[in-house]
Interface confidence: medium
C-alpha cells in the first residue's frame, strides 16, 4: 500500500435545503483505471461511512440509488454532493481515495471538510 495526497476544503456550509458540496482532489502517481471514493464522517471520535463508490477513469462517478451522495469526476478531481443533511449531521467529512487498479494500490485520506448544517427556522404562521 502506497500513500497518496488528498486535498479537500476545510469548511463548507450546507444550504438551507440540507445540501453540501465539496471537491476532493487526489494526486495520482500513476495511471489508474479504477478509483474508489469513500466519504467518512467523524463526530465525537466516532467514524462512520457515509457513502462509497468505485468508478472508472473516463467514466462518470455513480453512487448507488439509495445513497445520500451524488458526484461527478473529472481527471483527478471528484465533486461530491451530500443531501438530506440536518443540524445533527454537522461534523467532519473525510474523503478517502483508493487507486484500485492496476497495481500498486494507493491510498489517500484527506484532512476532512467540516460541514456545518443549520436547520431552517420554521415559517411563522401568517394570516395573509
Amino acid at each position: 500500500c502506497k500513500a497518496m495526497h488528498v486535498a479537500q476544503p476545510a469548511v463548507v456550509l450546507a444550504s438551507s435545503r440540507g445540501i453540501a458540496s465539496f471537491v476532493c482532489e487526489y494526486a495520482s502517481p500513476g495511471k489508474a483505471t479504477e478509483v474508489r471514493v469513500t466519504v467518512l464522517r467523524q463526530a465525537d471520535s466516532q467514524v462512520t461511512e457515509v457513502c462509497a463508490a468505485t468508478y472508472m477513469m473516463g467514466n462518470e462517478l455513480t453512487f448507488l440509488d439509495d445513497s445520500i451522495c451524488t458526484g461527478t469526476s473529472s481527471g483527478n478531481q471528484v465533486n461530491l454532493t451530500i443531501q438530506g443533511l440536518r443540524a445533527m449531521d454537522t461534523g467532519l467529512y473525510i474523503c478517502k481515495v483508493e487507486l484500485m487498479y492496476p497495481p500498486p494500490y494507493y491510498l489517500g485520506i484527506g484532512n476532512g471538510t467540516q460541514i456545518y448544517v443549520i436547520d431552517p427556522e420554521p415559517c411563522p404562521d401568517s394570516d395573509f
Epitope: E34, R36, T38, C51, A52, A53, T54, Y55, M56, N59, E60, T62, F63, L64, D65, M100, Y101
Partner: nanobody
Framework: EVQLLESGGGLVQPGGSLRLSCAAS????????MAWYRQAPGKGLELVAG???????NYVDSVKGRFTISRDNSKNMVYLQMNSLRAEDTAVYYC?????????WGQGTLVTVSS
C-alpha cells in the same frame, strides 16, 4: 460477495463477431460499475470497456467503433459485443464488477482470432 461467470468466448476468424456474456450473482445490489478487461498472451491486463449503473460507457481507443458494452440490470448481466475482430484482440477476457465495497473478477473466457 459477488460472483461473476463469463461465457461466449471461442475461436473466430478475423473480421468475425462474438458476444461475451457475464452473469452476476450474490450481492449484486452493491454493484455500480461493470467492465471487461483482457489479457493478451504475454501482456498485462487492459481495461477494454466499462459501463456504470446509468448506462454510461467508456472504451479503450483500440476497440472504439468495434466493441459495444451493454448492461441488463433486470437480468444482472453485462455483455460485450465484439465486431470486426482482429488477431490482436486474441486474449482472455475477464468480467469485472465494482461497487462501494465490491471488487470482483470473473474466471475469464478465451477469445482467439485466427484464420
Amino acid at each position: 460477495e459477488v460472483q461473476l461467470l463469463e461465457s461466449g468466448g471461442g475461436l473466430v476468424q478475423p473480421g468475425g463477431s462474438l458476444r461475451l456474456s457475464c452473469a452476476a450473482s450474490g450481492s449484486i445490489f452493491s454493484i455500480n460499475h461493470m467492465a471487461w478487461y483482457r489479457q493478451a498472451p504475454g501482456k498485462g491486463l487492459e481495461l477494454v470497456a466499462g459501463v456504470n449503473s446509468r448506462g454510461t460507457t467508456n472504451y479503450v481507443d483500440s476497440v472504439k467503433g468495434r466493441f459495444t458494452i451493454s448492461r441488463d440490470n433486470s437480468k444482472n448481466m453485462v455483455y460485450l459485443q465484439m465486431n470486426s475482430l482482429r488477431a490482436e484482440d486474441t486474449a482472455v477476457y475477464y468480467c469485472r464488477a465494482l461497487g462501494g465495497a465490491v471488487a470482483a473478477w470473473g474466471q475469464g473466457t478465451l477469445v482467439t482470432v485466427s484464420s
